[in-house]
Structure formats: C-alpha cells, structure tokens
C-alpha cells in the first residue's frame, strides 16, 4: 500500500519571536528513504529540515525519530521571523540507487502566518 503523508493543519499563525510546531505523520517508513521539510514548491522550494542527521539552526524534531518505528516527523521552529512565512511541505523520499532520492509522497502543506509582535 502506498505511504500517506499527513499534515493535519492547513495553516498556523505564530507571533514573531515565538515558536511553532508543524505536524507531520506518515503511515509507513517503507520504502526506505528520508523525510524532509520544504518551504514552497517547484524548483525554488527551500529545504528547511532533513531527518538525516544534519544540524539545522532554529529547527528540531519534536518526537524521538531514533525509534525504529517512529512515524511522527513533526518539527518545531524557534524564534520565528517574518521571513519564515510561507507554505511548508513534509515530503517522503525513496532512497536512490546511485542517483538522487526520489520524491514519492508529499503532505498537503501547512501555511505559516507570522504575526507582528
């Protein structure tokens, strides 16, 4: 069965300087491959977070993603700025075989509105 990626919130509002959580769950970890968060779509989309061990300032995972059966890939963005506004997508990839990973499923997106403090 095809993996499903769920982002339950269509939008969230956060005051500048505060933190916000963007929720994402998947129905399966198979086929093996990373899960990444992006802001925007198409060629100009920006990688926001990858669950592959790298460090991303101001962003961290919410659940313990080292659990081998973890299906929760929500993230917390700290010290939000107006530049963080936009639509965020949680994307499941299938690992590539000596080529780039292949995107197989994306969540519906969560729009982040940043309110002036």
């Amino acid at each position: 069965t095809e993996v499903k990626v769920t982002q339950p919130e269509k939008s969230v509002s956060v005051a500048a300087g505060d933190s916000t959580i963007l929720n994402c769950t998947v129905t399966s970890l198979l086929p093996v491959g990373p899960i990444r968060w992006y802001r925007g779509v198409g060629q100009s989309r920006l990688l926001i977070y990858s669950f592959t061990g790298e460090h991303f300032p101001r962003i961290r995972n919410v659940s313990d993603t080292t659990k081998r059966n973890n299906m929760d890939f929500s993230i917390r963005i700290s010290n939000v700025t107006p530049e963080d506004a936009g639509t965020y997508y949680c994307v499941k990839f299938q690992r590539g075989s000596s080529e780039p990973d292949t995107e197989i499923q994306s969540g519906g997106g969560t729009e982040v509105y940043v309110l002036a403090k």
Epitope: L29, L30, P31, V32, P34, F51, T52, G53, D64, T65, T66, K67, R68, N69, R95, S97, S98
Partner: antibody, heavy 118, light 108 residues
C-alpha cells in the same frame, strides 16, 4: 572527537551474568540511538541490541532476546548491556556503536573481551 | 529475516581496483553500510547509507547499489587497505541489523 569506551568484560563461568558499560564522549549522547555488536574469536560481526536515543525503545535479534538487555543513562552518557545465563558461545569481543539516522553504525568502541569458561 | 552474502576473499594488486559485493537484502526495505576491520582492531565504518563516506575515509572508497546487490569499490588499492570488510544492513521492515560473513581483502 567521538569516543566510545567499553568496560566490564572479563572471565565468567557458564550460567553467570555480566553487565557491560560503554562511556560516550565527543557528541550529544542523548540524541543518538546506540547498539551493541559482538565478535566471537575468528568469527564475523553479530548485532546484539539497539536502543533509541531516549531509551524507551529497545530492539533485539531472536538469538539473544530475553537473555540480554540494553539500557542507557543519558545523564551519565553511558550505555549498558546486561547479559544473563552466559554460555561458552557468548565468548567474544563486545563493541558498542553509535547509530546513524537510519540505524547503521558510524562510530565504534575499541571493544571489551568477555570469556565464558568453567 | 534476511542473510547478506559476501565472497570470502578478494585479491588485488596495488594500484588496481577492488570490488566487494554483498547480496541478499531487500532494496525496498534495507539500508547498507561497509565496515573495515584490521587484525586485532575494532571495525571502522568506510561507507554508510549505501554510498555515504565518512569525512575521515579516503575518497578511493565508494559504495554503490544495483537491485539487491551492493558493491564496495576501492580504487587504487593500497597495502594499508588489506583487511576484512563486512557488509551491514538495516531492515526497516523488521527493525533488525544484519552483517554479511565478511570478505578478506588481500593486497598482492
């Protein structure tokens, strides 16, 4: 630099128990899953147990499940392996290893030798 | 569970290319790594996540995959590369780690 130092090995008699320790430094221990791997003399590598970063989830192959227990104390940056009802077949060098994001291993300790002999 | 199969031995002359294969995993659910072990020493990870090389590992080590077979390639083999090489796998379906039986690389 990442450093993993095992201790607690030694000579024990069949049927006895032993607890191994692995002291970790040079990285954020509480953020990484960990595993134990052993190698019998002249043999290959055998995975024994894995544990999530928070310590709530543990994983074992059928060969040692119920007899070996992995645990960790994140406040002490230490990983443990409790081994019960040891037999001669458990004689091996025991390594602790740090897991990558996808549960392979990137850093290994130097190992501690366990000898089970009457 | 699954078994990973490696050739027991591979021989190569210095400066040549050595290829060590590992088969038996399910590409849909398995990640692979390669571990080098010299006599009396602990294993060292030379490749993880199929083809990722740790920063302190020479560029002559590379990993690739094709179907259910993964390959460790050592280009321009040096005498210091003589060691046992273990293929390792993590199966996301069963949550189990497995090792191949190991391949002894001899540099002639």
């Amino acid at each position: 630099d990442v450093q993993l130092v095992e201790s607690g090995g030694g000579v024990v008699r069949p049927g006895e128990s032993l607890r191994l320790s692995c002291a970790a430094s040079g990285f954020t221990f509480s953020s990484n899953a960990m595993s134990w791997v052993r190698q019998a003399p002249g043999k290959g590598l055998e995975w024994l147990a894995g544990i999530s970063a928070g310590g709530s989830d543990t994983y074992y192959p059928a060969s040692v499940k119920g007899r070996f227990t992995i645990s960790r104390d994140n406040s002490k940056n230490t990983l443990y392996l409790q081994m019960n009802t040891l037999t001669a077949e458990d004689t091996a060098v025991y390594y602790c290893a740090r897991e990558t994001w996808n549960h392979l291993f990137d850093y290994w300790g130097l190992g501690t030798l366990v000898t089970v002999s009457s | 569970s699954y078994e990973l199969t490696q050739p027991p031995s591979v021989s190569v002359s210095p400066g040549q290319t050595a290829r060590i294969t590992c088969s038996g995993g399910d590409y849909y659910s398995t990640y692979y790594a390669w571990y080098q072990q010299k006599p009396g020493q602990a294993p060292v990870t030379v490749i993880h996540s199929d083809d990722k090389r740790p920063s302190d590992i020479p560029e002559r080590f590379s990993g690739s995959s094709s179907g259910t077979t993964v390959t460790l390639t050592i280009s321009g083999v040096q005498a210091e590369d003589e060691a046992d090489y273990y293929c390792g796998g993590y199966d996301g379906r069963t949550y189990i780690n497995t090792f191949g039986g190991g391949t002894k690389l001899t540099v002639l």
